[in-house]
Amino acid sequence: IWELKKDVYVVELDWYPDAPGEMVVLTCDTPEEDGITWTLDQSSEVLGSGKTLTIQVKEFGDAGQYTCHKGGEVLSHSLLLLHKKEDGIWSTDILKDQKEPKNKTFLRCEAKNYSGRFTCWWLTTISTDLTFSVKSSRGSSDPQGVTCGAATLSAERVRGDNKEYEYSVECQEDSACPAAEESLPIEVMVDAVHKLKYENYTSSFFIRDIIKPDPPKNLQLKPLKNSRQVEVSWEYPDTWSTPHSYFSLTFCVQVQGKSKREKKDRVFTDKTSATVICRKNASISVRAQDRYYSSSWSEWASVPCS
Amino acid sequence: RAVPGGSSPAWTQCQQLSQKLCTLAWSAHPLVGHMDLREEGDEETTNDVPHIQCGDGCDPQGLRDNSQFCLQRIHQGLIFYEKLLGSDIFTGEPSLLPDSPVGQLHASLLGLSQLLQPEGHHWETQQIPSLSPSQPWQRLLLRFKILRSLQAFVAVAARVFAHGAATLSP
């Protein structure tokens, strides 16, 4: 058993029917010695008396808010949550496996630049009685600070018969060094509580591996005289790290016909302009990627040829 | 060329070669992004590689003030990786494919280090750890890890030379 926060405790259980469970001793936070009684949740049934209460925790029915009273007065509370270890593995019932980029990916994170700011998100089908808290650090043995905000519900989607909820959190490394080569990964730890079930999820990454620039901005076409060619130009996204002579991007320019089946023409360039042939009803798209490290491409920025 | 005393390197040549190094490092190990090597017990294997750290002056401001600290650090790393790529880790079993980019990568590391430090000038270099994995699978894993950290190292070096070529070239 360990303390998650004040008056909230997590009991770790080997989870199989008839498992012995854990013996837990609760102590009433009071100087009083006599006349103390204990109850669980909303029930008025007295579970025991005295300053301490010893219980055997085996099932969810044994978890919940234990309260000690004296003469009708509430003295203190202890909330017991269960963390299930099923068949040798801590349970992962609360969050959905996103399966990208590999199985057992519950947390996904992205950064728009090298400033040390990043966003993580996760999915669940649970809509109520759900709380998350997020901690992060750079490295684990001698951790350096990363500050995370509160997790918020960022999207709701209908998937078949189920509703899916996306939560996200923003974090910022306290003393980020954008130009340095990272040697210690960022660790992100999410505590999830659904009703009386506790679970924890972790992710470990380097900022360089989760970089995904915003799409290029101000995408413009300039027709070239007496030609089907156009000059496409664009700018670095505002959110990208500066100076651009140091934090450089490379770009992919694509000409795509109306039908998805039509052949796509692609040009790669380090410049912020390119000359392409604009076909009727086609569109021109540009996306960006770090020039020197193959992290994710940005989403496409597009303009119609006409 | 970078002389320990402090003259400038051939920024544009260094930029071109370091960008080539980036391309080669990724073609040598392209699937790296899909493989979490940190799960594979990091032990002491690649912990000793020289990293370009915050105080090494490789940021735009540090380069403007005095690029020598940063160039020395990059040189140190290039020599370190050049020795690793020429070691038993890469020459032993399982043999690399004949068209593997590792050979080119090795030569380019040497080329860039020589651009930074011509004959007769000596910056102190870092000892390379004696890593001699006994099993072919350990060697394979170590190759992945070394190439993975090399990708990060050359990315920073390429940024340095690109910025130098754009802002510090005479």
Epitope: W15, Y16, P17, D18, F60, D87, G88 | -
Partner: antibody, heavy 114, light 107 residues
Framework: EVQLLESGGGLVQPGGSLRLSCAAS????????MGWVRQAPGKGLEWVSY????????SYADSVKGRFTISRDNSKNTLYLQMNSLRAEDTAVYYC???????WGQGTLVTVSS | DIQMTQSPATLSVSPGETATLSCWAS??????LAWYQQKPGQAPRLLIY???TRATGVPARFSGSGSRTEFTLTISGLQSEDFAVYYC?????????FGPGTTVDIK
């Protein structure tokens, strides 16, 4: 007390089908993963299939993949194993288990023979 | 699949003596290893899980040790009801796999 009671075994011809059931009692069935393990006469134990508490995730041994389907009805506290395209080598006692650890039923014998 | 090997295939022991059963995994299974006891005509019974933790109601004379690839089940002061077949099982990676079993019989 945890109890698991298998039923549905019997003699079936090769290529035939059987559906095994396992009625669970004495614990909160919907909270636990369940599985099927088999034991050929005089032989060792082999995992056949495994199902998570909600029923959404399942796993199968290669030897039965595509032929057997594990499912559960948490409202009825029952685990099922639908066995199709049965072969002689599927002959065994089939045990219902509470996940990879915990309790086992007494087993039901499936004989595949012409 | 992870292969489990057990040794010896048969162990002849006198009541009151100590029996030591070994189990090896073809690759690391961390501590995700269980030991089962099976008597003729009965279902297997869980004795040890997590390589070292005794299941509910299992007498203290049964103890497990080891991790990764090498595991041991020790039965000290063998009693008549302990003569049976003992299987080890890894549950680290699906498909979970059992060893071929060790028969402990009366010397």
């Amino acid at each position: 007390e945890v109890q698991l009671l298998e039923s549905g075994g019997g003699l079936v011809q090769p290529g035939g089908s059987l559906r095994l059931s396992c009625a669970a009692s004495g614990f909160t069935f919907s909270h636990y993963r369940m599985g099927w393990v088999r034991q050929a006469p005089g032989k060792g134990l082999e995992w056949v299939s495994y199902i998570y508490s909600s029923g959404g995730l399942t796993s199968y041994a290669d030897s039965v993949k595509g032929r057997f389907t594990i499912s559960r009805d948490n409202s009825k506290n029952t685990l099922y194993l639908q066995m199709n395209s049965l072969r002689a080598e599927d002959t065994a006692v089939y045990y219902c288990t509470t996940g990879a650890l915990g309790q086992w039923g007494q087993g039901t014998l499936v004989t595949v023979s012409s | 699949d992870i292969q489990m090997t057990q040794s010896p295939a048969t162990l002849s022991v006198s009541p009151g003596e100590t029996a030591t059963l070994s189990c090896w995994a073809s690759q690391s299974v961390k501590s995700n290893l269980a030991w089962y006891q099976q008597k003729p005509g009965q279902a297997p019974r869980l004795l040890i899980y997590g390589a070292t933790t005794r299941a509910t109601g299992v007498p203290a004379r049964f103890s497990g040790s080891g991790s990764r690839t090498e595991f041991t089940l020790t039965i000290s002061g063998l009693q008549s009801e302990d003569f049976a077949v003992y299987y080890c099982q890894q549950y680290d990676v699906w498909p979970f796999t059992f060893g071929p079993g060790t028969t402990v019989d009366i010397k």
